[in-house]
């Protein structure tokens, strides 16, 4: 299709080489088309271009994204060619940064329902550059935590080194929805609730004598509880003896509850005690089996191919540890009678 009629938007993504970060493009179909289409109101009133109405579908995923190759080849369907780019409803998510993401991205409705719809498209020219500003050592992270129940703030990474007075007007989005009241480089949260968690996008306009473009950054905000003050709690095994059948295989599970820690390095391992000897056992990887805001339950199993007489003389010890301390639970095997 002819993309010359598409409205055009220029965006800049300056990524930090030190951290993992994501990026998003919104399918900013001009008003009032978008209200039919993505049920979103992303553009501020100043940004709304005049367009003929688009007789769009109500299906949120009914948009098609393309990339325009720089060599003039035909448009490429994003879903087929770019595994690190994911379409979610009207949003395009870039999972990994890199200059190779630079280029022109076009979105338009899949279903063309009227002659006007042919021109109902947006072309986004994305420039991606690594951050070079070494003077701003403490720029805000693209992953920010808010402590539940307390006061907090979300900073726009690309503007966090500027004072509020210097900062240009910022447009904020949360999970793709415009936060119309937020215009500064920092969102202040009086009391943090779990609904403050989400993907925030901050945009501001930068201009030179030739043109203007939108500088965008994405912030993943997580609501967290305070770090635990407790060592891990072993949920299983509870009993210190297990009745088993000789010659049969046996799996013993160790499950432990680890309280939340911002820097989380849980340890869960099995070792065997046999008279004066003690050694760690090579066992399958630990796995998380339940995770909540406050804690995580991790399981690690020890597998005996067949229980021997020697195993009855040994103690099987599960050892768990976090930054606060460690806990152990030992199990002695006992032959099942009758």
């Amino acid at each position: 299709f002819n993309i010359s009629g598409c409205s055009t938007k220029k965006l800049l993504w300056t990524y930090s080489t030190r951290s993992e970060e994501e990026f998003v493009l919104f399918c900013d179909l001009p008003e009032p088309q978008k209200s039919h289409f993505c049920h979103r109101n992303r553009l501020s009133p100043k940004q709304v271009p005049e367009h003929l109405p688009f007789m769009g579908s109500n299906d949120l995923s009914d948009v098609q994204w393309y990339q325009q190759p720089s060599n003039g080849d035909p448009l490429e369907d994003i879903r087929k060619s770019y595994p690190h780019i994911i379409q979610d409803k009207c949003t395009l998510h870039f999972l990994t940064p890199g200059v190779n993401n630079s280029g022109s991205y076009i979105c338009r409705p899949k279903m063309i329902k009227s002659p006007y719809d042919v021109a109902c498209c947006v072309k986004m020219i994305l420039e991606v550059k690594p951050q070079t500003n070494a003077s701003c050592e403490y720029s805000a992270s693209h992953k920010q935590d808010l402590l539940l129940g307390s006061t907090g703030s979300i900073s726009c990474p690309s503007l966090s080194c500027q004072s509020d007075a210097q900062s240009p007007a910022v447009t904020w989005y949360k999970n793709g929805k415009l936060l119309s009241v937020e215009r500064s480089n920092r969102i202040v949260v009086d009391e943090v609730y779990d609904y403050h968690q989400g993907t925030y996008v901050c945009d501001y306009t930068q201009s030179d004598t030739v043109s203007s473009w939108t500088v965008r950054a994405v912030v993943q905000v997580r609501t967290i509880v305070g770090d635990t003050k407790l060592k891990p709690d072993i949920l299983d095994p509870v009993e210190d003896t297990l009745e088993v059948e000789l010659g049969k295989p046996l799996t013993i599970s160790c499950k432990a509850r680890f309280g939340f820690e911002r820097v989380f390095n849980p340890v869960i391992k099995w070792y065997i005690k046999d008279s004066d000897l003690e050694w760690e056992v090579s066992v399958p990887e630990a796995k998380s089996i339940k995770s909540t805001l406050k804690d995580e339950i991790i399981e690690r199993n020890i597998i005996l191919e067949k229980v021997t007489q020697r195993d009855l003389r040994r103690k099987f010890v599960c050892f768990v540890q976090n930054s606060i301390g460690n806990t152990t639970q030992s199990v002695q095997l006992k032959e099942k009678r009758g």
Partner: antibody
Framework: QEQLEESGGGLVKPEGSLTLTCKAS????????IYWVRQAPGKGLEWIGC???????TYYANWAKGRFTISKTSSTTVTLQMTSLTAADTATYFC?????????????WGPGTLVTVSS | AQVLTQTASPVSAAVGGTVTINCQSS????????LSWFQQKPGQPPKQLIY???TLASGVPSRFSGSGSGTQFTLTISDVQCDDAATYYC???????????FGGGTEVVVK
């Protein structure tokens, strides 16, 4: 959707036997214990026992040892075999899941199945 | 076997008021915190409200809270609603799993 469902309840004569089944769906059962709990009409809850799915090790309330047997019969089903039944065993029998053999987090229950022991 | 003794039934409460139910164990529960609270309405299975003595189960309103350690535990329902009329059970887990037990139940009547 995570679910547990009991089946096999019904009318049984005194001294008779009955096997109840608990079927799990919508979650990986291997990390859990399956508990059996009963409730006589108009009375409170009574813990019968549990089984570790990973290794089939069982624990029973002292009063239930001998007459009640909990087994894993497939990767998604657990049974409760009851023998020498009396009128006192008339109850709704529930299965539930927990991550530990020592009541920790019984977050999912079946709707229950009614067992009536009567001549 | 361990015995869990609960506040005698029935307990009356006014809408908007506060209800406290106690549960006493004949021996310390495992890790001093293996005590759960359940709500049961006629014809329904029990629904877990609190586990680990004080942790609110998923989807349970924060009007419900649990406290206690060792042998003495309390369930508190603040800002009582009509929907809170039910029987409440405590359940204890022990170092010998065979001792696991439920309390006798406490019926809450909301006026």
């Amino acid at each position: 959707q995570e679910q547990l469902e009991e089946s096999g309840g019904g009318l049984v004569k005194p001294e008779g036997s009955l096997t109840l089944t608990c079927k799990a769906s919508g979650f990986t059962i291997s990390s859990y214990y399956i508990y059996w709990v009963r409730q006589a009409p108009g009375k409170g809850l009574e813990w019968i026992g549990c089984i570790a799915i990973i290794n089939s090790i069982t624990y029973y309330a002292n009063w239930a040892k001998g007459r009640f047997t909990i087994s894993k019969t497939s990767s998604t089903t657990v049974t409760l075999q009851m023998t020498s039944l009396t009128a006192a065993d008339t109850a709704t029998y529930f299965c539930a899941r927990d991550l530990s053999s020592s009541i920790y987090d019984m977050d999912l229950w079946g709707p229950g199945t009614l067992v009536t022991v009567s001549s | 076997a361990q015995v869990l003794t609960q506040t005698a039934s029935p307990v009356s409460a006014a809408v908007g008021g506060t209800v406290t139910i106690n549960c006493q164990s004949s021996q310390s529960v495992y890790n001093n915190n293996r005590l759960s609270w359940f709500q049961q309405k006629p014809g329904q299975p029990p629904k877990q409200l609190i586990y680990r003595s004080s942790t609110l189960a998923s989807g349970v309103p924060s009007r419900f809270s649990g406290s206690g350690s060792g042998t003495q535990f309390t369930l508190t329902i603040s800002d009582v609603q009509c929907d809170d009329a039910a029987t409440y059970y405590c359940a204890g887990g022990y170092s010998s799993s065979s001792d696991n037990a439920f309390g006798g139940g406490t019926e809450v009547v909301v006026k």
